[in-house]
């Protein structure tokens, strides 16, 4: 077969080939940020000629052109400056309102390198309508100027811009416009991962963690899908495997889907996952009708077995057939469960379509979506039972109109996105499920994205101030209780001056809480063994503080999971009959268990908890500490089995002021507290300039560093005594 010519360079840019110079290969151009390629791609035809998709005239030289953002077409009740036909990257547009109108949205917007404006649509509103003025996004024209109940407004985009969002919106009885805000965008524009992750996550996370079977009541903030105890989520992952997707890109599709599966199974919802790859025909790798679709390892292994070569005989993009196979799956499940049953009607359905192009065979995918909406009986009341996310990757041949038509339209949410490449997709899936935004008390969720603050990464972490100074740390274990160390409180029982500082999204300094009640273990007495030559003894070094008010759950404040509770059992995805012993075996399951604690400056530091024979050799070092234990004969007099031991090799040592803080592990993207910082043989902060400076102990130090943490598995009777009506404990 003839190969295509190689004179296809783009001035100022680069290109990649999906299958070399052979027929069927897709050539994709890319340009530096702030520029876009024209044309975006070419296809090598069987004749040995390059063809530009959608082009009418003969092959033109590929060039990188400057990205521009669309200009306002009309701006009601105000003025904007400067008035240009379109705006360069970095250019600003400013909005002002006439007297009597108040500006809502962004007064100044900047054109970003992806051809999208930053900020929000500026609207000059006088508050006269039943619904607020829906505004006119940049580049759009609106018809309809009445904002009463039942009134409709319609939008279209000027010149060659593409509309995403709802072209028609209706003012609903609740004073909210139906659908989602329309945006006019350049055909070459794309979304940045940092914008997509939160937008996708906000919408998607409503479904996750919302089923917390241990919670009796639920406050619903905005749209939050309530998957009841009997409720269920079906997640359908559709992966494009057509010719234009390179094998490497398909691997990233698979990896992104795996990330998604891994994350979604880490939340306590009943979920079944379907996996469908498609090109000219769909291939169902996992059906929601298969019991294995509820098992994370089975789902991931079916994903791993997805083979790029499965579709080499039919390389078109038949999105209709892929969506239709979802419809058929739903139809079969409905017949199985019975159309009228709650079991069928209470299932929520989420479809994620990962594609790199427009469908080019099999009919309109919209038809399949209509069938799906029909079978699920999606109407205004049941709108929350279906979410379709259409994610285009590659911005070359992706059809904005089609993606927009497929994606769900829900107020304040976006369901259609175009990303620049598969790397960006991976980034989005890594960060989209930031369920730490949930308002209920789901435990052990920390934001793991790269741009999260320290407090968002460890939102259970609190600072305790018995005096004006910060003295100790602790961990939220519910919305009103903090677990910490008893030795932090050595001034008797007057806790009227004590304060607990909890993370707060509104303030970098956090929020201070008074203490209603302090429960300090009666067994704690630092001088208990003084007459045995043990000058300090930290047995039973544990305390609970009840805060004077409940903490509002947020990205910055959320409890950690305590093992041996039902809450932790759900987070570990363990079967219902699990015991405390099972949790210990799962969490402290090695001779050396990687764990973390939080430093004075809020960062997460690493340690290794030594178990079994390694625990013995870890603790043995204490016999070399002659000041605190001048005539110690048995190390176990000091290091009882209440303690976990760390501090060997490359471990960080906690400072004195980090006492009481959680020692925690990560499992399945959730965090579990197994211990609390108690005492040690070396203080890396001693005499340092500030919270950011720690000194490593010299290798020659005698005794070498060792750190001891109260083992929560050994404090169960005491924890149950005081938290029995706060947490749901499992049998021992």
């Amino acid at each position: 077969a003839p190969s295509c010519p190689q004179n296809v360079n783009i001035s100022g840019g680069t290109f990649t080939l999906s299958h070399g110079w052979a027929p069927g290969s897709l050539l994709t151009y890319s340009c530096p940020q702030g520029l876009y390629p024209s044309p975006a791609s070419r296809l090598c035809k069987s004749s040995g000629q390059w063809q530009t998709p959608g082009a009418t005239r003969s092959l033109s030289k590929a060039v990188c052109k400057p990205v521009r953002c669309p200009a306002p077409v009309s701006f009601e009740n105000g003025i904007y400056t400067p008035r240009l036909g379109s705006y360069p990257v970095g250019g600003n547009v400013s909005f002002e309102c006439e007297d009597g109108f108040i500006l809502r949205g962004s007064p100044v917007r900047q054109c970003r390198p992806n051809g999208m404006w930053d900020g929000e649509t500026a609207v000059c509103d006088n508050g006269a309508g039943h619904c607020p003025n829906p505004g006119i996004s940049l580049g759009a024209v609106r018809t309809g100027f009445r904002f009463g109940h039942g009134d409709k407004v319609r939008y279209r985009c000027s010149s060659n811009l593409v509309l995403t969002g709802s072209s028609e919106r209706e003012c609903q009885g609740n004073g909210v416009w139906s659908g989602t805000e329309p945006i006019c965008r350049q055909p070459y524009s794309y979304d940045f991962p940092e914008d997509v992750a939160p937008a996708l996550g906000t919408s998607f996370s409503h479904m996750l963690g919302a089923t917390n079977p241990t919670q009796k009541t639920k406050e619903s903030l905005g749209r939050k899908i309530q998957i009841q105890r009997s409720g269920h989520l079906n997640l359908y992952l559709l992966l494009d495997c057509s010719q234009s997707v390179s094998e490497n890109d398909f691997l990233i599709f698979k990896e992104s889907a795996s990330l998604m599966v891994d994350r979604i199974f880490s939340f306590e919802i009943n979920v079944s996952v379907a996996i469908i790859t498609f090109a000219s025909e769909p291939k169902v790798l996992m059906s929601v009708l298969n019991d294995n679709s509820r098992d994370m390892t089975e789902v991931i292994s079916s994903l791993e077995n997805a083979n790029y070569k499965d579709h080499e005989n039919g390389t078109g993009t038949n999105t209709y057939a892929a969506l239709n196979s979802v419809y058929l799956m739903m139809n079969n499940q409905m017949r199985l469960l019975g159309m009228e049953t709650m079991a069928w009607q209470e299932i929520r359905h989420a479809i994620i379509l990962l594609t790199d192009g427009k469908s080019n065979m099999g009919g309109s995918p919209k038809t399949a979506v209509d069938h799906i909406r029909e079978i699920l009986n999606i109407n205004q009341k049941r709108n929350d039972y279906l979410d379709i996310y259409a994610i285009g990757v590659g911005k070359l041949d992706v059809d904005w109109r089609e993606l927009n038509e497929l994606g769900s339209k829900k107020d304040g949410e976006r369901h259609a996105f175009i990303l620049q490449d598969t790397k960006a997709l991976h980034q989005v899936f890594e960060h989209m499920l930031d369920v730490s935004k949930l308002t209920d008390t789901i435990c052990g969720v920390g934001n793991m994205s790269a741009n999260a603050s320290d407090q968002e990464r460890t939102p259970w972490h609190v600072t305790i101030k018995p005096k004006s100074q910060e003295t100790c740390r602790g961990a939220l274990i519910s919305d009103q209780w903090v677990l910490t160390a008893a030795h932090c409180f050595r001034d008797g029982n007057d806790h009227s001056l004590w304060r607990v500082n909890v993370g707060d999204p509104k303030s970098q300094w956090g929020k201070e809480f008074l203490i209603e009640k302090a429960v300090i273990s009666p067994g704690f007495d630092v001088f208990a063994k003084k007459n045995q030559g043990i000058l300090e003894f930290y047995g039973d070094d544990i305390a609970l503080l009840k805060l004077a008010q409940k903490v509002k759950m947020s990205t910055h404040a959320r409890p950690i999971c305590l093992p041996c509770t039902m809450e932790a059992n759900l987070a570990l995805r363990r079967p219902q009959g699990s015991t405390c012993r099972d949790h210990e075996n799962e969490l402290l399951n090695k001779q050396s268990v990687p764990a973390h604690f939080v430093a004075l400056n809020g960062s997460k530091l690493n340690i290794n908890l030594k178990m079994g024979v390694e625990w013995t050799s870890c603790a043995e070092v204490v016999s070399q500490e002659k000041t605190m234990f001048p005539n110690l004969t048995d190390v176990r007099e000091v290091v009882t089995d209440q303690f976990l031991c760390s501090g060997t090799q490359e471990d960080e040592s906690p400072c004195k002021g980090e006492s009481g803080g959680a020692v925690f592990l990560e499992r399945r993207f959730r965090f579990f507290q197994v211990g609390l910082v108690s005492w040690g043989l070396y203080n890396p902060c001693l005499g340092s300039a500030d919270k950011n400076s720690r000194k490593r102990a010299p290798r020659s130090k005698v005794p070498p560093p060792r750190d001891f943490h109260i083992n929560l598995f050994r404090m169960q009777p005491w924890l149950r005594q005081h938290l029995g009506d706060v947490l749901n404990f499992l049998p021992l």
Partner: nanobody, 122 residues
């Protein structure tokens, strides 16, 4: 907050000894970690020694280990620093400090004495 007053500084020959005292007002002395810092002319303030609130554990800077001993008497609300084998480089103003957490971070310490000068010279 604890009020602190140091005493016992003075001029001493190399190899000589000196005992510094720091008396604290306030009934909460016994619940504070106590420490000594020093500042030589033109230099940063540096950590010398610390003792836990129980008196059970002590820590020393490498430069004074084996020569200086920190101790406390909770019944007298007093902290001590016994300095032996003094050297010229020990010349500095010595400050007593109280810290509830025990980390003695220079940025956070709010209880300092006014200092006592120790000069080691022949």
């Amino acid at each position: 907050q604890v009020q602190l007053v140091e005493s016992g500084g003075g001029l001493v020959q190399p190899g000589g000894s000196l005992r510094l005292s720091c008396s604290a007002s306030g009934h909460t002395f016994r619940s504070y970690y106590m420490g000594w810092f020093r500042q030589a002319p033109g230099k940063e303030r540096e950590f010398v020694a610390a003792i836990s609130w129980t008196g059970g554990s002590t820590e020393y800077a490498d430069s004074v280990k084996g020569r200086f001993t920190i101790s406390r008497d909770n019944s007298k609300n007093t902290l001590y620093l016994q300095m032996n084998s003094l050297r010229a480089e020990d010349t500095a103003v010595y400050y007593c400090a109280a810290d509830y957490s025990g980390d003695f971070l220079l940025s956070d310490l709010d209880s300092w004495g006014q200092g006592t000068l120790v000069t080691v010279s022949s």
